[in-house]
């Protein structure tokens, strides 16, 4: 599924996000556009090995099981599969797990350097929460 | 462009220990997940231990768990593999990759050229 972007920001304010660990609901959803462009389904190969899953791009060297990366940790205990559904529980539930490890958003690339410092609060404005 | 440059392999007998290092250098950015392959003659290039930024979190291939530490110097740029009680099937060409974040940019994977391992019985 390919969200829209104040369909997502429901979405994630919903399922919690909204200021969890600090983080306004505008990073998430700047984070989303710049890791899969709002699409669930988004994969990525990555030359280690790994590839990243779904709508938060999720690891899985460290976070999920996606039986094919060796050294996994699947430090979210959940199979990178559901990372890809249209039901973004998951992720959402992975994503906090990750951004309470100890580096904040900045364990999201895109974020880091598309979204952190920026007026993230424009990727909401004007949608119905 | 960010260069790695790993060091420290050699010939051990078994039993004998080793301290790989993996050295990356350039501007401007930061290691995020690192880690090592090895490459034995004749077969595929796997998996031995990697670390990530956040948390410090540790993955190791079941061959060397018990065995081998992966640590890293973030000061230094440098992410380092301490191989105990060496086995003859550790032998191997070692190889350090990186996943690199430039600041205000983009991120990429790079792959050193490699040491090579020897362990003799």
């Known amino acids: 599924k390919v969200f829209g972007r104040c369909e997502l920001a429901a979405a994630m304010k919903r399922h919690g996000l909204d200021n969890y660990r600090g983080y306004s609901l505008g990073n998430w959803v700047c984070a989303a556009k710049f890791e899969s462009n709002f699409n669930t389904q988004a994969t990525n190969r990555n030359t280690d090995g790994s590839t990243d899953y779904g709508i938060l791009q999720i690891n899985s060297r460290w976070w999920c099981n996606d039986g094919r990366t060796p050294g996994s940790r699947n430090l979210c205990n959940i199979p990178c599969s559901a990372l890809l559904s249209s039901d973004i529980t998951a992720s959402v539930n992975c994503a906090k797990k990750i951004v309470s490890d100890g580096n904040g958003m900045n364990a999201w690339v895109a974020w880091r350097n598309r979204c952190k410092g920026t007026d993230v609060q424009a990727w909401i404005r004007g949608c119905r929460l | 462009q960010v260069q790695l440059v790993e060091s420290g392999g050699g010939l051990v007998q078994a039993g004998g220990s080793l301290r790989l290092s993996c050295a990356a250098s350039?501007?401007?950015?930061?290691?995020?997940?690192v880690g090592w392959f090895r490459q034995a003659p004749g077969k595929e290039r796997e998996f031995v231990a990697a670390?990530?930024?956040?948390?410090?979190?540790?993955s190791y291939a079941d061959s060397v768990k018990g065995r081998f530490t992966i640590s890293r110097d973030n000061a230094k740029n440098t992410v380092y593999l301490q191989m105990n009680s060496l086995k003859p099937e550790d032998t191997a060409v070692y190889y350090c990759?990186?996943?690199?974040?430039?600041?205000?940019?983009?991120?990429?994977?790079?792959w050193g050229q490699g040491t090579q391992v020897t362990v003799s019985s």
């Open positions: 350039g501007s401007s950015f930061s290691i995020y997940d």
């Open positions: 670390t990530i930024e956040t948390g410090g979190h540790t």
């Open positions: 990759y990186a996943k690199i974040v430039y600041d205000q940019g983009p991120s990429y994977y790079y």
